[in-house]
Interface confidence: low
């Protein structure tokens, strides 16, 4: 009687000896075994010589066998798949001679500290190589030269500080590269060569953004649709690109793809991509939306372009359902901008909660204007292109409402300015009204002149404790307060400098809301400068305190709508959480300092 179970589902005889407390190969294995499972045994050491007479052997599973040593002293010429994962291997012997037909090699979750230069020599058929979760600190040059058919390479969760510049040379079939969770500071210039990699994972490294990062920055911009955030148990094809997951460790975790690189030397011989940083600026704007949610016990600041580095980036980053699939062909118009993504705050209690909505719009006028074209073409290098579509969703296990959707879309080119809209809503089944949807629609810059002045009139603050509407008006135009919205608008069809009108209102509670007490104190801080050469900066902040009990039907919406001729281009909006233990919102930096 066989110790192991035997079946023949395919043309190969499959023998399963898993978890049989084996310390050696069983003596009664069928000679025509094609698939052999030896996982979860206590083999300690293993020699391929013990399997040479199994002439059918195609798949060999030696995972979780407490292996400390592997000897390749017998040739298994038909072996295509070898699983050595979850063992205690500190080194790998040369495999090519013994395993010339190997197509998949899994040595993940071992204790490999280094690899010898010729360890993969002879593995000309290798298509998948899994080395994640080891202790690799470096890789030998030429490691992958013998494996020209490689399609998948996983080096995640190691201690790699740098990569050999020619690591990927010749790997024309490579389609998936995992490099997340290492100690990488930069990517060597030319590292990716001309490879078109549909799936790349680069997050949770120590990317150091200085002039050396420019090659990598531009590669990210050019390949924004192919950079993903890895999520346990989720197939890469079921996720959505997340280029903003690649962050500068030295710049408050700002996305690498948006690193400005100002002051960096540029010469055609120095970088592959970045020879255009000196091109004159065109009109550009930057809108920052900031949310702060503070509870008595726990404070979470939804702030821009910063991620809490202390927690697991794989779990904290919100993944994206697919809006499109990457292709190996590059489109003529590369949409490179993408929102940053949030960390997930811990589950918050229903305590008195302070909210802050901060709109910071910076208009940078310039004599240069853009003539929109009828076809999509790559913009001049200094123009920040826009991401057409990306979506953000909350992981199912999260109980904290967080901003969960960010959609950026670019309408077709038009010479008529079109509104730029941001909509933020909360989900119904929530214990705390935290914005959960942000929709941003952006356009190519309009040819209409940019206003250089703005007039804002602030009304006297209401003396009531619970005002429901605060309205900012101009002499010529006012906007009717709209319940549940905060709206920033400008008059339509204006050709002269446009005064700004803003309406701020609190979300109206639904009829099922109980025990709602609101204290609202809107504050407007405006900095206006008139010379064309200087930016116009308007900072609009609204703070209010709410102690509440929410039922599932509650829904509130905050809308920020710059109307026509507002010239707001929103190339970059990022919502990221950072946590503090401060209980008072007024000790929070968001509250401390109002600009004069």
């Amino acid at each position: 009687q066989h110790t192991c179970s035997i079946s023949k589902v395919t043309s190969l005889l499959e023998v399963n000896c898993e978890n049989k407390k084996l310390t050696a190969l069983p003596a009664d294995l069928p000679a025509d075994t094609g698939i052999l499972h030896l996982g979860e045994n206590q083999l300690g050491t293993f020699s391929t010589a013990s399997l040479v007479h199994f002439t059918h052997l195609t798949y060999l599973y030696l995972d979780r066998c407490e292996l400390t040593s592997l000897q390749t002293n017998g040739k298994l010429i038909k072996l295509e798949n070898l699983d050595l994962s979850h063992n205690n291997l500190k080194s790998l012997p040369s495999l090519g001679w013994a395993l010339p037909a190997l197509t998949t090699l899994d040595v993940s979750f071992n204790k490999l500290g280094s690899l010898s230069p010729g360890v993969l020599d002879g593995l000309s058929q290798l298509q998948e190589l899994y080395l994640q979760n080891n202790d690799l600190k470096s890789l030998p040059p030429g490691l992958l030269l013998p494996t020209t058919k490689l399609k998948k390479l996983n080096l995640a969760n190691n201690k790699l500080r740098e990569l050999p510049s020619g690591l990927l040379d010749g790997l024309e079939d490579l389609d998936t590269l995992y490099l997340q969770r290492n100690w990488l500071r930069t990517i060597p210039k030319g590292f990716f060569g001309t490879l078109l990699l549909p799936f790349v994972f680069l997050h949770a490294n120590s990317w150091y953004c200085d002039c050396e990062i420019l090659y990598f920055r531009h590669w990210l911009q050019e390949n924004a649709n192919n950079v993903y955030l890895w999520k346990q148990g989720v197939d890469v094809k079921d996720t959505t690109p997340n280029v903003a997951s690649v962050r500068c460790a030295n710049l408050d975790n700002a996305p690498v793809y948006s690193y400005p690189g100002k002051g960096c030397p540029t010469s055609s011989g120095d970088t592959d991509y970045d020879d255009y940083d000196d091109i004159p600026d065109v009109p550009a704007t930057r809108t920052e939306v900031k949310f702060s949610t503070n509870t008595k016990v726990h404070t979470t600041h939804w702030s821009l372009l910063a991620a809490a580095p202390s927690t697991s980036q794989d779990s904290q980053m919100i993944s994206l359902p697919p809006t499109h699939k990457p292709t190996k062909k590059q489109s003529t118009f590369i949409h490179t901008q993408s929102p940053g993504f949030t960390t997930l705050p811990e589950t918050m209690e229903s305590n008195p909660t302070f909210y802050s909505l901060k709109l910071n719009t910076v208009l940078i006028p310039s004599p240069t204007t853009l003539e929109p074209t009828s076809t999509q073409a790559t913009p001049e290098p200094n123009i920040q292109p826009m991401l057409t579509t990306s979506t953000l969703t909350t992981p199912e296990h999260s109980t904290t409402p967080v901003p969960t959707t960010t959609i950026l879309t670019t309408p077709e080119h038009s010479t008529i300015p079109v509104p730029t809209t941001a909509i933020l809503t909360t989900p119904k089944p929530s214990t705390i009204p935290v914005p959960t949807t942000a929709t941003l629609t952006t356009l190519e810059p309009s040819t209409t002149p940019v206003p250089t002045t703005a007039t804002l009139t602030t009304p006297e603050p209401s003396t009531t404790l619970v005002p429901t509407t605060a309205t900012l008006t101009t002499p010529e135009h006012s906007t009717t307060p709209v319940p549940t919205t905060a709206t920033l608008t400008t008059p339509e069809h204006s050709t002269t400098p446009v005064p700004t009108t803003a309406t701020l209102t609190t979300p109206e509670p639904s009829t099922t809301l109980t025990n709602l007490v609101s204290t609202i104190s809107p504050v407007l801080t405006t900095t206006l400068t008139t010379p064309e050469s200087t930016p116009i900066e308007t900072i609009l902040e609204q703070f209010f305190t709410t102690e509440l009990t929410l039922l599932p039907t509650l829904e509130s919406t905050t809308t920020i709508i710059p109307e026509q001729n507002s010239f707001l281009n929103l190339p970059e909006v990022a919502l990221v959480s950072s946590d503090t233990s401060e209980s008072s919102p007024f000790l929070n930096s968001d509250f401390c300092c109002f600009l004069p």
Epitope: L29, A31, V52, T58
Partner: antibody, heavy 118, light 113 residues
């Protein structure tokens, strides 16, 4: 019945390349491993290359890195790409069907002569 | 690599008589797990490709006359033609299919005496 027909042989100079083809019929080509075996004039048989039904190739050391076996199941055709040819590669090259994974050869083609000479 | 050595190089036998060809391997071809010896025999007539006669030492390929038989174990093997026929004139090769690279013996030329 099973038929294997080789083509592509000829005279070639040392260092040059040649590609042999083997058209198969009379059996489900994609289900069988296939091989090339050669025979130098007046000499014995020498195994050159095999490829599994799944497309995995393997070779003896004498041709490893120089010869490449491949197959196109849609065309029922086996190939042998021979690069850096040497005088000692002169032989009749037979296409053969391998029985299962046991690597004995149950059907053979008539062969095609490759002569490597300057 | 496993080296296969055939003897004799050539053999002349009268029609109707028994012909015996030997093959020796440099290492055992016995798979102790299934007790099979991985040895095959081929017949090659002038101007023709080889033809499979026997595999696993003694299993006759379909269509092969039963006057052909194989025996042996480990490293020593024998092909026997019990009653030689005129159409049996050919060169006979043994081949080990135990371990790659698959190797052949040098061949034994069988003639009629």
């Amino acid at each position: 019945q099973v038929q294997l027909v080789e083509s592509g042989g000829g005279v070639v100079q040392p260092g040059r390349s040649l590609r042999l083809s083997c058209a198969a019929s009379g059996f489900t080509f994609s289900s069988f491993a296939m091989s090339w075996v050669r025979q130098a004039p007046g000499k014995g048989l020498e195994w050159v290359a095999s490829i599994t039904s799944a497309g995995t190739p393997y070779y003896p050391d004498s041709v490893l890195g120089r010869f490449t076996i491949s197959r196109d199941n849609s065309k029922n055709t086996l190939y042998l790409q021979m690069n850096s040819l040497r005088a000692e590669d002169t032989a009749v090259y037979y296409c053969a069907r391998s029985r299962g994974y046991e690597d004995y050869f149950d059907y053979w083609g008539q062969g095609t002569l490759v002569t490597v000479s300057s | 690599d496993i080296v296969m050595t055939q003897s004799p190089d050539s053999l002349a036998v009268s029609l109707g008589e028994r012909a015996t060809i030997n093959c020796k391997s440099s290492q055992s071809l016995l798979n102790s797990r299934n007790q099979k010896n991985y040895l095959a025999w081929y017949q090659q007539k002038p101007g023709q490709p080889p033809k499979l006669l026997i595999y696993f030492t003694s299993t006759r390929e379909s269509g092969v006359p039963d006057r052909f038989s194989g025996s042996g174990s480990g490293t020593d093997f024998t092909l026997t033609i019990s009653s030689l026929q005129a159409e049996d004139v050919a060169v006979y090769y043994c081949q080990q299919h135990y371990s790659s690279p698959w190797t052949f013996g040098g061949g034994t030329k069988l003639e009629i005496k």
